[in-house]
């Protein structure tokens, strides 16, 4: 069975989270995609979304979040720049497919942002200093207000978790890895 993994990223204030969500391109290439935060016990909140229909490799910026949908590669790239401690939380990518419920993508991202010198990412790896230059053509897309009540979460596990999803069942099993990926400032 495919496992929905919850990856933990430990970053410093000022750094950039740079992640990707993959999808079945034959089914979802031009579908509208969104980046959501999941607060304990609440419905997921949409922070940014692509245009509808989603445009290929056309960056959409909403505040400090940049989404870039690579239709031809079946990948949604998500960047959160200039991270703040209050950005810490659990995030997910979803695909809007009205009137059906949003389709959740792999993987969920547990982001932990700590104060400190942003030049030193987690782990013992060093990353190059980098200020993202956002293309002037970025646009802001309007996101649907629709959120599925079925995606309300219970308090998710505090550690990284593997979520096994045979059919529609969800089984949580704790694992302990933390991903400290060197991510740019």
């Amino acid at each position: 069975a495919t496992k929905l993994t919850e990856e933990k990223y430990e970053l410093k204030e000022g750094q950039t989270l740079d992640v990707k969500c993959d999808y079945t391109l034959e089914k979802f290439a031009s579908s509208q995609k969104a980046w959501q935060i999941i607060r304990d016990g609440e419905m997921p909140k949409t922070l940014a979304c692509t245009e509808r229909p989603s445009k290929n490799s056309h960056p959409v910026q909403v505040g400090r979040i940049i989404l870039e949908d690579y239709h031809d590669h079946g990948l949604l790239r998500v960047r959160m720049v200039n991270l703040q401690v209050e950005d810490s939380g659990l995030y997910q990518c979803v695909i809007y497919q009205p009137p059906k419920e949003p389709h959740m993508l792999f993987d969920r991202i547990r982001l932990v942002v700590t104060k400190g010198f942003s030049g030193t990412p987690g782990s013992n790896e060093n990353s190059t200093q980098n200020v993202y230059k956002i293309p002037p053509t970025t646009t802001k897309a309007l996101c649907p207000l629709y959120t599925s009540p079925r995606t309300v979460t219970q308090a998710p596990p505090k550690s990284t978790a593997d979520v096994s999803t045979p059919d529609s069942e969800i089984n949580l099993t704790n694992v302990t890895d933390i991903i400290r990926v060197p991510v740019f400032n």
Partner: antibody, heavy 122, light 107 residues
């Protein structure tokens, strides 16, 4: 140890298909992307596409769309790349390479198979 | 697609020499640049990721620098075992693209 072991050399006729395998060991197969890169004799490196072994989702460059199929069998930690409608210019060494974590925008290849030579000749 | 232009395409240097290879991207790649070494008949090997980070186990004579569109790969003191072709690779945008390679030979 941590390695990617590829299947042996193949000789194919134009119009045929070839399926190359890449068996991973020494790490959690489903946590890292598998990429396919090819190299024609005396030429440079050409990225073909990627596979997320966990979700099974794949992406290919425009050049190979419709001709390449990337799959995996997680029970045996093996990824496959099938290229169809072969032509003489597909003669090359095909490499599988481990990418970054499946969720990270980290496209560097820190582990490579030894390569599989595919010769297309009538 | 982002084009990666490497120069020179080949060079010959003496053991102990400082060797410099450049890689130019057709647009800003936000420091998403890696360098690989490929010895004859072998698979490529990652040397440097994200412009300047040395992969574990890679000798410190190899280094990388640059930003924006212009990047440099340096071997501070060329050794006989460094005979190989070196490639840069960008991953700021898909598709991933490699430079054409620089073949390094010993005089």
């Amino acid at each position: 140890q941590v390695q990617l072991v590829q299947s042996g050399a193949e000789v194919k006729k134009p119009g045929a298909s070839v399926k190359v395998s890449c068996k991973a060991s020494g790490y959690t197969f489903t946590r890292y992307d598998i990429n396919w890169v090819r190299q024609a004799t005396g030429q440079g490196l050409e990225w073909m596409g990627w596979l997320n072994p966990n979700s099974g989702n794949t992406g290919q460059t425009q050049k190979f769309r419709g001709r390449v199929t990337m799959t995996r069998d997680t029970s045996i930690n093996t990824a496959y790349m099938e290229l169809s409608s072969l032509r003489s210019e597909d003669t090359a060494v095909y490499y599988c390479a481990r990418g970054g974590y499946t969720s990270a925008w980290r496209w560097y290849f820190d582990l490579w198979g030894r390569g599989t030579l595919v010769t297309v000749s009538s | 697609d982002i084009q990666m232009t490497q120069s020179p395409s080949s060079l010959s240097a003496s053991v102990g020499d400082r060797v410099t290879i450049t890689c130019q991207a057709s647009q800003d790649i936000n420091n998403h640049l890696n360098w690989y070494q490929q010895k004859p008949g072998k698979a490529p090997k990652l040397l440097i990721y994200d412009v300047s980070n040395l992969e574990t186990g890679v000798p410190s004579r190899f280094s990388g620098s640059g930003s924006g569109t212009d990047f440099t790969f340096t071997i501070s003191s060329l050794q006989p075992e460094d005979i190989a072709t070196y490639y840069c690779q960008q991953y700021d945008k898909l598709p991933l693209t490699f430079g054409g390679g620089t073949k390094v030979e010993i005089k």
